[in-house]
Interface confidence: low
């Protein structure tokens, strides 16, 4: 006869490991007992359990409560055992020794491999700001046994770098994603993908990119200078910009205080019925935590009694 077993048994951390050992004998042969031992190189043999055809299963104290026979029905020639709730320390070489009648003793070895699936973590880098050079967007770390694979899934252009730290029974892999921040990256997902033989499917963690920026400011409302005449109602200037975080707006007048009756409503400057005292240089100041921008315009209120046309200067400055 001969013993049937596996070269390698692979199990995920916390699962039960079936250690197979089946005697394929000739007609009339019987199995008397099966002894299981752990036989890691250089450490001698450590008994797990003894399976006796008459007296049943005896488990050594070190494995009390963790070694069982597979559930019935059982074949008397099957010496397989279950190792409950496998932990990393269980990884190693195991031997089954089978005593048969009348053929004598047989032995076989197998290796138990315990997979430790990773629990990945994604850490965003420092705040991203337009105008920065190559900057860390996020790092992703996963530790497991064997070492997990860490990659990135995104349509954002960037570069990756990985490093690995080996521990006694596992390895930690960290991958960093660097990019040159631009406002077009706002809202784009950056996904860390972790692959590992102990996972049924890849684990994915998504981070949404946020890039601080502030667009140039401009002022609308003076496109038709002929509308800015004495007595006109509803005249207004609107300051245009865009930013992340959303910017705040402030209005001042360069050549004096804002005239009475002029209303500031965020990005909009509203005028009462126009008089010549509303002529002047108005400045929109846009700012967020990232930057600030100014745009100024010259308002020249026309007197319908006068024929001379006036010019409008538009100046934008940072």
């Amino acid at each position: 006869g001969e013993l049937e077993t596996s070269d390698v048994v692979t199990v995920v951390l916390g699962q039960d490991a079936k250690l197979p050992c089946f005697y394929r004998g000739d007609s009339g042969e019987q199995v008397g007992q099966v002894a299981w031992a752990r036989v890691d190189a250089g450490e001698g043999a450590q008994e797990l359990a003894l399976l006796h055809s008459k007296y049943g299963l005896h488990v050594s104290p070190a494995y009390e409560g963790r070694v069982e026979q597979p559930p019935p029905p059982r074949n008397p020639l099957d010496g397989s055992v279950l190792l409950r709730n496998a932990v990393q320390a269980d990884e190693g070489e195991y031997e089954c020794r089978v005593s048969t009648f009348p053929a004598g003793s047989f032995q076989a070895r197998l290796r138990l491999r315990v997979l430790v699936p990773p629990l990945p973590s994604l850490n965003p880098g420092p705040a991203l700001e337009e105008g920065q050079g190559l900057t860390l967007a996020a790092s992703c770390t996963a530790e497991g046994s064997p070492a997990p694979s860490v990659t990135w899934d995104t349509e954002v252009k960037g570069t990756t770098s990985s490093r690995s730290f080996k521990h006694s029974r596992s390895a930690a892999v960290t991958s960093e994603f660097h990019l040159v921040p631009s406002r077009s990256m706002n809202g784009q997902p950056l996904t860390c993908v972790v692959s590992h033989p102990g996972l049924l499917q890849d684990q994915r963690i998504t981070h949404i990119l946020h890039v601080s920026f502030l667009a140039e400011a401009s002022v609308r409302g003076l496109e038709d200078q002929n509308l800015w005449h004495i007595g006109r109602e509803g005249a207004m200037l609107k300051c245009l910009s865009e930013g992340q975080p959303p910017p705040s707006y402030n209005w001042t007048r360069l050549d004096g205080p804002l005239p009475s009756g002029v209303r500031v409503d965020g990005d909009t400057l509203g005028f009462p019925p126009l008089t010549t005292e509303h002529s002047g240089i108005y400045v929109c100041h846009v700012s967020n935590e990232f930057s600030s921008r100014d745009s100024q315009v010259t308002v020249d209120v026309l007197d319908p009694q006068e024929d001379s046309g006036k010019q409008v200067d538009l100046v934008s400055a940072s």
């Epitope: 899934d153 349509e155 406002r183 077009s184 784009q188 499917q201 994915r204 998504t206 949404i208 865009e242």
Partner: antibody, heavy 117, light 106 residues
Framework: QVQLQESGPGLVKPSETLSLTCTVS????????VHWIRQPPGKGLEWLGV???????DYNPSLKSRVTISVDTSKNQFSLKLSSVTAADTAVYYC???????????WGQGTLVTVSS | DIQMTQSPSSLSASVGDRVTITCRAS??????LAWYQQKPGKAPKLLVY???NLASGVPSRFSGSGSGTDFTLTISSLQPEDFATYYC????????FGGGTKVEIK
């Protein structure tokens, strides 16, 4: 073929919370975002927000204080909640799928929600 | 937010006509623009993404062009099933849609 199906009450009272569900079938939503977009009767389209299969969300800043999107990946179901509704929230609400960029290759058929007392 | 201005808001055309719809962004959106077709009572259907790429299953009479702020959707030879409303949409940051262009039968 990927299919999206919106469901939920067609009538919501003012000041209450609108709740809709989008069920995705016929394909995996891993790597994809599920978006909510609405269209008031006779008007244009407005993007409300997105949730990714990993749970990350991104909302329209103009509605951020009122919108919550969540996911039950085991059921491939995505939920929209819009609080403190008014008549201006009356619209056809669509869910749609996108890849990593926010353009929408698959849409649900839409569900009309009317806000009225 | 970035504003998307579509023109014209409506147009009348005949089968076989060449139709052009334009969309202007209030600032550069690079090539981050999509076009959709919507028929009454139906959801929008993706026609073009990334300004110039035809979506799967869309007839070749549709084409998109442009980058930066100015974009165009062209139907080279209008077919009966093309009478619908067309929307542009940018996907640069918070998405916004154009106001729509209704293509009607002349």
């Amino acid at each position: 073929q990927v299919q999206l199906q919106e469901s939920g009450p067609g009538l919501v009272k003012p000041s209450e919370t609108l709740s809709l569900t989008c069920t995705v079938s016929g394909g995996s939503i891993t790597n994809y975002g599920v978006h909510w977009i609405r269209q008031p009767p006779g008007k244009g389209l407005e993007w409300l927000g997105v949730i990714w299969s990993g749970g990350s969300t991104d909302y329209n800043p103009s509605l951020k204080s009122r919108v919550t999107i969540s996911v039950d990946t085991s059921k491939n179901q995505f939920s929209l909640k819009l609080s403190s509704v008014t008549a201006a929230d009356t619209a056809v609400y669509y869910c749609a799928r996108s890849g990593k960029w926010y353009y929408f290759d698959y849409w649900g058929q839409g569900t009309l929600v009317t806000v009225s007392s | 937010d970035i504003q998307m201005t579509q023109s014209p808001s409506s147009l009348s055309a005949s089968v076989g006509d060449r139709v052009t719809i334009t969309c202007r962004a209030s600032q550069s959106i690079y090539s981050n623009l999509a076009w959709y077709q919507q028929k009454p009572g139906k959801a929008p259907k993706l026609l073009v993404y990334a300004a110039t790429n035809l979506a799967s299953g869309v007839p070749s009479r549709f084409s998109g062009s442009g980058s930066g702020t100015d974009f165009t959707l062209t139907i080279s030879s209008l077919q009966p099933e093309d009478f619908a409303t067309y929307y542009c949409q940018h996907f640069w940051g918070t998405p916004t849609f154009g106001g729509g262009t209704k293509v009607e039968i002349k």
